[in-house]
């Protein structure tokens, strides 16, 4: 069973009194409808809450929304609906919060049917004041801020116009018509697809990809026959229709679309899809859907150019386009990702990689857990994690896995222990080493959040009944204490804490229901008095990430370097604080063949770390060979894994081979064999 109050646990003294003095209730003078909450800026304490109430009448919908503002992390709220002239705000657009600490907020209003354009309310002082602006168009999407300059906004209109503002929404200009999708790139560049004939849907696969680097003064067409495009890290991807059939292929650019290379990935048909699962400046995880309605595909990982791909994981669960995948980046430890596979017997199993997709394994069985009914062997089974797919299937899973970059090594997730994911009620598990080992943390489903960079974990039981108890742990989930935050239980709807897990405040949201009315209510609890003192040097201990065998000279080496972290001791009850910075020390490892991937035209035989030349090129390899750029076909067989920092040791450099002469096939016409496309 999970550790709890009944065991000999690390007690926090007098916590009830300390928390009672720091529990703040706010009842919203509001009929219950929907509520949305946004944090404005980082460490500002400013929260905006929008409540909306819809009454569908026979002819029209009557709606009312209210806007509230807090500047003390949710302890007190002020009704500021009058600042937006009591206007009904469209919740589907949410609150568009500006990047970084710009203090900018855009709210999109509901306008009557006959109006010429939409209406927005803009604030650039953390929602202290708003300016009403009438738009020359009806917005189709939320306003998008340029990551580089929060004064630059773009939006699509309901008539597929691309509109840009250079003065934070004061004045708008339509820079292009017939636009399907638009995204900000780096350096205030805008990428967008356009249709020539009918519509976005009708022209799918015949779209053009355009770029503007000067907010619409000039344009460059950087792609044709486009199906869709995406940005990930420093890579720009486009799926491009093939000349000869209805298949499409991924093309990659690392220079904003000036030059393109074909990616060495399988082509996909009409019913299939590509999906960028994760990307950074080093590499990309790409999912390629299987033909047919299988619900799975293959994960490929890229080289540093985004061109050559290694097969990473087969039978990767990903239901139809835009559907559900459990792919999760464990942000608390470099190189770790968790996802689900659909096994031959149609059961779903969790897999984890610790080396950025190089190898995948099952999750180790938690020491304090038994194998469930799904296990053939009661002594040998694995932990299986519930994520997006389970949530979409309406299993009793209130939250996806949680990790935070500044709470090193901590991963919290719902799971079951057996041979596959179970439909039974899950428990909550925690790992303190980035997913290598797991412990049952809480019995049954819970909502959970990380505060003070891991110094406190807070949880609330997932229940259909009203609740009034919160649980907290100061030792990474080993021991739990419960606190009754109100005498009158509430119907719980969510936990809210400031993004970044640096705060010590948690807000519990819910509603109270009486015979005649129901109202929104929030309870904000500040844990600052539980963690009375600031952490000192003696409160931290040194931890080597990815350690699996201390007797191995290269223990902890991932992507050519190991990292040691200073981590809070489990017994220390102190504040990391808002300014806490993770202290880590990298050390470079010697190179081994594991630090290299096989370049195009080479592969690793089973249980061998050497890259061997493929005897013949087939399928998508051959296509890449024929249509890929010439310089990509000259190789010594190895490429360093993206982001790998190893030095010395093995250097598998050997003679460079030109694979162009292998680019021949009876299945392709002679004229195709001579052509090269850049």
């Amino acid at each position: 069973s999970a550790p709890g109050e009944d065991e000999e646990c690390g007690r926090v003294r007098d916590f009830v009194a300390k928390l009672a003095n720091n529990t703040h209730q706010h009842v919203f003078d509001d009929l219950r409808g929907s509520v949305s909450l946004s944090w404005v800026g980082d460490s500002t304490g400013v929260i905006l809450v929008l409540t909306t109430f819809h009454v569908p009448l026979v002819i029209m919908t009557f709606g009312q929304s209210k806007l509230y503002r807090s500047e003390d992390y949710g302890k007190n709220f002020k009704d500021i609906t009058d600042l937006i002239n009591n206007t009904f705000i469209r919740t589907e657009f949410g609150m568009a919060i500006g990047p970084e600490n710009s203090g900018k907020v855009v709210l999109t209003a509901e306008v009557s049917g006959g109006s010429r354009g939409g209406r927005i309310f803009r604030s650039s002082d953390f929602a202290k004041n708003f300016v009403q602006t009438d738009l020359p168009f009806h917005p189709l999407t939320q306003m998008m801020y340029s990551p580089q300059n929060s004064d630059y906004l773009l939006a699509l209109s309901t008539e597929n116009g691309l509109w840009v503002s250079k003065n934070f929404g004061g004045k708008w200009e339509e820079i292009h018509k017939a636009v399907c999708l638009a995204k900000w790139g780096s350096d205030n560049t805008i990428f967008f697809t356009t249709y020539a004939n009918g519509s976005c849907k009708a022209d799918l696969g015949a779209l053009e990809l355009w770029r503007t680097s000067d907010l619409g003064k000039s344009f460059k067409t950087i792609g044709v026959k486009i199906y869709s495009f995406g940005l990930g890290g420093r890579f720009l991807f486009a799926s491009v229709m093939a000349d000869k059939d209805t298949t499409r292929r991924i093309h990659v650019s690392t220079d904003q679309g000036d030059t393109w290379s074909m990616a060495q990935l399988p082509s996909v048909g009409q019913e299939q899809f590509y999906s960028i699962l994760a990307a950074n400046d080093d590499m990309v995880f790409m999912h390629v859907d299987e033909p047919g309605d299988t619900g799975f595909g293959t994960i490929f990982t890229s080289d540093d150019r985004g061109i050559v791909y290694s097969k990473s994981l087969d039978r990767h669960l990903y239901t139809t386009t835009g559907g559900e995948t459990d792919f999760t980046n464990v942000t608390s430890l470099r190189g770790v990702y968790i996802t689900s596979v659909l096994s031959e017997d149609n059961s779903i199993q969790t897999m984890i990689t610790f080396d950025q997709g190089g190898r995948w394994t099952h999750l180790r069985k938690p020491e304090n857990s038994e194998c469930d009914a799904t296990a053939k062997n009661k002594n040998e089974c694995s932990l299986h994690i519930h994520a997006s797919y389970s949530i979409s299937q309406k299993l009793n899973v209130p939250m996806a896995p949680l990790s935070e970059p500044n709470a090193v090594g901590i991963v919290i997730a719902h799971g079951s222990v057996g041979d596959a994911i179970s439909v039974m009620v899950p428990d909550v598990y925690i790992s303190d080493d980035g997913g290598y080992s797991w412990t049952k943390m809480l019995e049954g489903p819970h909502y959970y959040t990380i505060l003070d960079s891991g110094g406190i974990i807070v949880a609330i039981e997932h229940s259909s009944r009203p609740i009034n108890v919160i649980k907290f742990s100061t030792d990474e989930g080993q021991c739990w204490q419960t606190y009754t935050f109100t005498r009158d239980p509430i119907y719980f709807t969510g936990l809210a804490s400031e993004p970044g897990a640096r705060s010590m405040n948690i807000s519990i949201w819910g509603f109270t229901e009486s015979f005649l009315t129901s109202q929104w209510v929030s309870y904000t609890i500040d844990f600052k008095d539980i963690l009375e003192r600031n952490c000192e040097e003696k409160d931290y201990t040194i931890w080597l990430a990815h350690s699996t065998d201390p007797e191995d000279y290269e223990d902890g080496c991932i992507a050519g370097y190991k990292e040691q972290f200073l981590r809070l001791r489990k017994s220390s009850v102190c504040q990391n604080g808002r300014d806490y910075v993770v202290t880590k020390q990298p050390s470079i490892c010697l190179c081994s063949l594991e630090d290299f991937l096989c370049d195009f035209g080479y592969y690793r035989p089973e249980n061998d770390s050497k890259c061997v030349e493929q005897p013949e090129l087939k399928g998508h390899d051959l296509e890449f060979c024929l249509y890929g750029r010439e310089e990509h076909l000259t190789t010594n067989g190895y490429r360093k894994i993206p982001g790998d920092k190893c030095q010395g040791g093995v250097n598998p450099v050997r003679e460079v081979k030109d694979l162009k002469k292998k680019c021949t096939s009876n299945f392709l016409s002679p004229e195709k064999q001579n052509s090269k496309s850049n």
Partner: antibody
Framework: QVQLVQSGAEVKKPGSSVKVSCKAS????????ISWVRQAPGQGLEWMGG????????NYAQKFQGRVTITADESTSTAYMELSSLRSEDTAVYYC?????????????????WGQGTTVTVSS | DIQMTQSPSTLSASVGDRVTITCRAS??????LAWYQQKPGKAPKLLIY???SLESGVPSRFSGSGSGTEFTLTISSLQPDDFATYYC????????FGGGTKVEIK
């Protein structure tokens, strides 16, 4: 099998310093923390501090802070403990010990390999 | 720093006896506790780590239990070779040792 071999006995005058070495053989020295523990005649064990050879991260018991320096030389698989401003109460057997390790935590699993001990006598 | 209080300081027992030594931490240390045996003129020897895990090569008559603040070392049947001094040591703060328990022949 891992072994820790310490330098020989020392006789020192009050106010001076002593530097004791601890050489590891037969294991991966760099991947384990080395702790220094002392034992005064007829007394119990007292932890002075420790070091992780990779990166040279040292930490010290509050009592010895400022008076002890622990270093490690990866190339020779040797750890050193230097104690300054010696007084007669520092007369003790000084042990180096390897911190066992089952996970990424360096100090949590007890000291599984010990040196033979170095007797330091402080006398005027 | 975390204080470790060991009791008793001296224990008289006979061969075959079941012996229990207790160690109390001044604050919770989870399971991060080790037990050592030391004989005169020799370096200490690790018996138990993580409160209850037996170090390899240590006879199974030695066992450890406890978590949080209360821990015990038990020798199920005392052997002639077991007369020595035993120390507990916590590892979840700057390392500290208990004062020791001398197990002597009754």
């Amino acid at each position: 099998q891992v072994q820790l071999v310490q330098s020989g006995a020392e006789v020192k005058k009050p106010g001076s310093s002593v530097k004791v070495s601890c050489k590891a053989s037969g294991g991966t020295f760099r991947n384990y923390a080395i702790s220094w523990v002392r034992q005064a005649p007829g007394q119990g064990l007292e932890w002075m501090g420790g070091i992780i050879p990779i990166g040279g991260w040292a930490n010290y018991a509050q009592k010895f802070q400022g008076r002890v320096t622990i270093t490690a030389d990866e190339s020779t698989s040797t750890a050193y403990m230097e104690l300054s401003s010696l007084r007669s109460e520092d007369t003790a057997v000084y042990y180096c010990a390897r911190q066992g390790r089952k996970t990424g935590y360096y100090y949590y699993y007890g000291m599984d390999v010990w040196g033979q001990g170095t007797t330091v006598t402080v006398s005027s | 720093d975390i204080q470790m209080t060991q009791s008793p300081s001296t224990l008289s027992a006979s061969v075959g006896d079941r012996v229990t030594i207790t160690c109390r931490a001044s604050q919770s240390i989870s399971s991060w506790l080790a037990w050592y045996q030391q004989k005169p003129g020799k370096a200490p020897k690790l018996l138990i780590y993580k409160a209850s895990s037996l170090e390899s090569g240590v006879p199974s008559r030695f066992s450890g239990s406890g978590s949080g603040t209360e821990f015990t070392l038990t020798i199920s049947s005392l052997q002639p070779d077991d007369f020595a001094t035993y120390y507990c040591q916590q590892a979840d703060g700057h390392i500290t040792f208990g004062g020791g328990t001398k197990v002597e022949i009754k």
